[in-house]
């Protein structure tokens, strides 16, 4: 014999107090699947948590974090403090990246600069706390008399023909 509750769609619950009639979820609750005997209470995004998506009868609210914080954990269950670019969050708070490392985001850890020489390249732009190094052509390509590097074409403004 089929369970009459299996006919209750998402957004409703099977109301035992009313002969297993499918009743709509009450305000501030939801059921995301059919056949539910209760509706779940909607998550409330309070304090550091901001509402990213409102609760509906069929889906829970979704939260994110207020500026200065970023989400951690499943479903943004926590908000972790941001640091500045060029820093990482340690047990003692935000600390500057050590020399030779960088962080170009407000979260996460400082990562070592790229070692250009591993790819046989030279450093074109030095790294900083906030930015990785930029690797350029290989040192051999830069040696005098090397013909393999094509010099860049002179820059022209659009609409002007070369003199």
């Amino acid at each position: 014999l089929q369970d009459p509750c299996s006919n209750c769609p998402a957004g409703t619950f099977c109301d035992n107090n009313r002969n297993q009639i499918c009743s709509p979820c009450p305000p501030n609750s939801f059921s995301s699947a059919g056949g539910q005997r209760t509706c779940d209470i909607c998550r409330q995004c309070k304090g550091v948590f901001r509402t990213r998506k409102e609760c509906s009868s069929t889906s829970n609210a979704e939260c994110d974090c207020t500026p200065g914080f970023h989400c951690l954990g499943a479903g943004c269950s926590m908000c972790e403090q941001d640091c500045k670019q060029g820093q990482e969050l340690t047990k003692k708070g935000c600390k500057d990246c050590c020399f030779g490392t960088f962080n170009d985001q407000k979260r996460g850890i400082c990562r070592p600069w790229t070692n250009c020489s591993l790819d046989g390249k030279s450093v074109l732009v030095n790294g900083t706390k906030e930015r990785d190094v930029v690797c350029g052509p290989s040192p051999a390509d830069l040696s005098p008399g090397a013909s393999s590097v094509t010099p860049p074409a002179p820059a022209r403004e659009p609409g002007h023909s070369p003199q």
Partner: nanobody
Framework: QVQLVESGGGLVQPGGSLRLSCSAS????????MSWVRQAPGKGLEWVSD????????FYEDSVKGRFTISRDNAKNTLYLQMNSLKPEDTAVYYC?????????????????WGQGTLVTVSS
């Protein structure tokens, strides 16, 4: 071991003020966000306020905004809740609670340590 001890509760008339304190020990207080949570007679737990580890970010339940102020003194390992313009509906046991991860604000379900609470009664 972690200990949180609240004080400062009592009987106050409507419109009056109280300052709650929470003395913390057993962990690096300055690295953790802290909260105040309350439980009115016969009701469930209600989040009241959060403060981040450094004290520069504070958050409040709508019903207490503009009346309550959370603060902390990291040198004294103490959390405070200044409560002004108190109403009968503020009557509750007030708990301080510690958040589980350094420099992180969690939801109430995830707080890992709670004090024993201090009773605030607002009545004429």
């Amino acid at each position: 071991q972690v200990q949180l001890v609240e004080s400062g509760g009592g009987l106050v008339q409507p419109g009056g003020s109280l300052r709650l304190s929470c003395s913390a020990s057993g962990f690096t207080f300055s690295s953790y966000a802290m909260s105040w949570v309350r439980q009115a007679p016969g009701k469930g737990l209600e989040w009241v306020s959060d403060i981040n580890s450094g004290g520069e970010s504070t958050f409040y339940e709508d019903s207490v905004k503009g009346r309550f102020t959370i603060s902390r003194d990291n040198a004294k390992n103490t959390l405070y809740l200044q409560m002004n313009s108190l109403k009968p509906e503020d009557t509750a046991v007030y708990y301080c609670a510690k958040h589980p991860l350094t420099f992180t604000i969690a939801t109430m379900n995830d707080y890992d340590y709670w004090g024993q609470g201090t009773l605030v009664t607002v009545s004429s």
